[in-house]
Interface confidence: low
């Protein structure tokens, strides 16, 4: 799967979305960073989102079918805090921070894991959680989003993600799929969908849908590997495509992305 040119910050500040902390038991989350990008770049990125969202609303008003066909899926892949762990630990990594694909085309949320022992068939679990805030609605008001981010910076909590961090009781939570050994089982809500876990832990949608927007958590469970960071998440956002999307988003690839 190719990585697009528009870089979104990842936790721990490293380009691959993870950083090794030498003192695992005491390691703490690091802020979400815009590496090499100043506030103007961030505002330009938010404006591009708003333009795309605006295109979606206009398209639905005039040509709803065409808007559906030409919709774009934006995937922000954000890595949970990653630390080195002592022996007998699982480390789960969601890589590739940002991808763009066309709606109804396949998308893969890559998830990798490392184990320090050899478990008997670790279980891979992908869960869906709806956004805590409406990302698309916020895209219509880039200034408010900017103000919100500035407020967070001022509050000394730049790593806070208002779209992801909230209690499960106030959002929808579903099991998408689980994999143990060679067998993949889809959650009840996703029965009939062409979704699977490929390789060891990548979540693959043969066709994306509007309702797929949300946060996807990849977790790996093993009775023999109890410590470490066994979960990472990816944000999947479905937006409308405007005719100028290629100019708005450097590195945009208008075609299916392979698993």
């Amino acid at each position: 799967m190719q990585q697009d040119g528009l870089g979104v910050g990842t936790r721990n500040g490293s380009g691959k979305g993870r950083s090794v902390h030498p003192s695992w038991p005491w390691c703490a989350p690091r802020p979400l960073r815009y590496f090499g990008r100043d506030a103007r770049a961030r505002r330009a990125q938010t404006a591009a989102m708003a333009l795309l969202a605006g295109g979606l609303s206009r398209g639905l008003g005039s040509h709803p079918a065409a808007a559906g066909r030409d919709a774009v899926v934006f995937v922000w892949l954000l890595l949970s805090t990653w630390c080195t762990a002592p022996a007998r630990a699982i480390q789960v990594t969601v890589s590739n921070p940002y991808h763009v694909v066309i709606l109804f085309q396949p998308v893969t949320l890559p998830c990798t894991y490392q184990m320090t022992s050899t478990p008997t068939q670790p279980i891979v679990i992908w869960k869906y959680k709806s956004f805590c805030r409406d990302r698309i609605a916020d895209a219509f008001s880039p200034a408010s989003v900017d103000n919100q981010l500035n407020a967070q910076l001022a509050a000394g909590n730049p790593g806070y993600n208002p779209y992801v961090e909230c209690q499960d009781s106030v959002r929808t939570v579903r099991v998408v799929a689980t994999k143990q050994g060679n067998a993949v089982t889809l959650g009840d809500y996703y029965q009939g969908r062409r979704i699977t876990i490929t390789g060891n832990a990548d979540l693959t949608f043969d066709q994306t849908a509007w309702g797929d927007s949300g946060v996807y958590y990849c977790s790996v469970v093993s009775a023999q590997d109890l410590q470490g960071n066994n979960e990472a998440y990816a944000e999947l956002i479905v937006l409308g495509r405007t005719s100028g999307v290629a100019e708005l988003l450097p590195g945009f690839q208008a075609g299916p992305i392979e698993d």
């Epitope: 893969t108 050994g181 993949v184 699977t196 876990i197 693959t204 043969d206």
Partner: antibody, heavy 114, light 106 residues
Framework: AVTLDESGGGLQTPGGALSLVCEAS????????MQWVRQAPGKGLEWVAG????????RYGSAVQGRATISRDNGQSTVRLQLNNLRAEDTGTYYC????????WGHGTEVIVS | ALTQPASVSANPGETVKITCSGG????????YSWHQQKSPGSAPVTVI????QRPSDIPSRFSGSKSGSTATLTITGVQAEDEAVYFC?????????FGAGTTLTV
């Protein structure tokens, strides 16, 4: 019980095309990756191609890259291997197999390119 | 390709170990499977998959283990009917992999 039944083998002409079909039963077909593996007479096993459970990801061995197409129909629980521009070295028994790390095999179908 | 010995021999009742190395480090872990072929042209039978998982119809004398990037198939109390060629299998991010096969003579 898991069963994998291959068909479509036989005598083939060099330069021609081959279409092998594997019919699966006894398990949730769409939940499993599927593979084609072949064995030339007197030789070892050679991985040919694989396809993910939903069908969106395909992989091919270097010997057939550019000549082979693997596809699947989850509604019919079938996986197909299309091999074009046949060569003498494509001769062998072709097996359909289940899983990324194979845990079940078909009985095989013999292909002779001559 | 995967590396495994060309042949091993044992007397009935003995314990046999066949090793395999060179598997792909796929998603940070090495995974292997083991397949038994009793005669050329006959269908292989999987005796171990995912390093140490044994299909329900395979006798318990077959077991698998992995240390680092090397996998081992162990047959405890080998029997005459275990005489066969054993292939190890693995995969990496782009391809399936097989060893050349180990001929077990009992």
């Amino acid at each position: 019980a898991v069963t994998l039944d291959e068909s479509g083998g036989g005598l083939q002409t060099p330069g021609g095309a081959l279409s092998l079909v594997c019919e699966a039963s006894g398990f949730d077909f769409s939940s499993h990756e599927m593979q084609w593996v072949r064995q030339a007479p007197g030789k070892g096993l050679e991985w040919v191609a694989g396809i993910s459970g939903a069908g969106s990801s395909t992989r091919y061995g270097s010997a057939v890259q550019g000549r082979a197409t693997i596809s699947r129909d989850n509604g019919q629980s079938t996986v197909r291997l299309q091999l074009n521009n046949l060569r003498a070295e494509d001769t062998g028994t072709y097996y359909c197999a289940r899983g990324s790390l194979i845990d079940a095999w078909g009985h095989g179908t013999e292909v002779i390119v001559s | 390709a995967l590396t495994q010995p060309a042949s091993v021999s044992a007397n009935p009742g003995e314990t046999v170990k066949i090793t395999c190395s060179g598997g792909g480090s796929y998603y940070g872990s090495y995974y292997y499977s083991w397949h038994q072929q009793k005669s050329p042209g006959s269908a292989p039978v999987t005796v171990i998959y995912e390093n140490n998982q044994r299909p329900s119809d395979i006798p318990s004398r077959f077991s698998g283990s992995k240390s680092g990037s090397t996998a081992t198939l162990t047959i405890t109390g080998v029997q005459a009917e275990d005489e066969a060629v054993y292939f190890c299998g693995s995969y990496d991010s782009s391809a399936g992999l097989f060893g050349a096969g180990t001929t077990l003579t009992v």
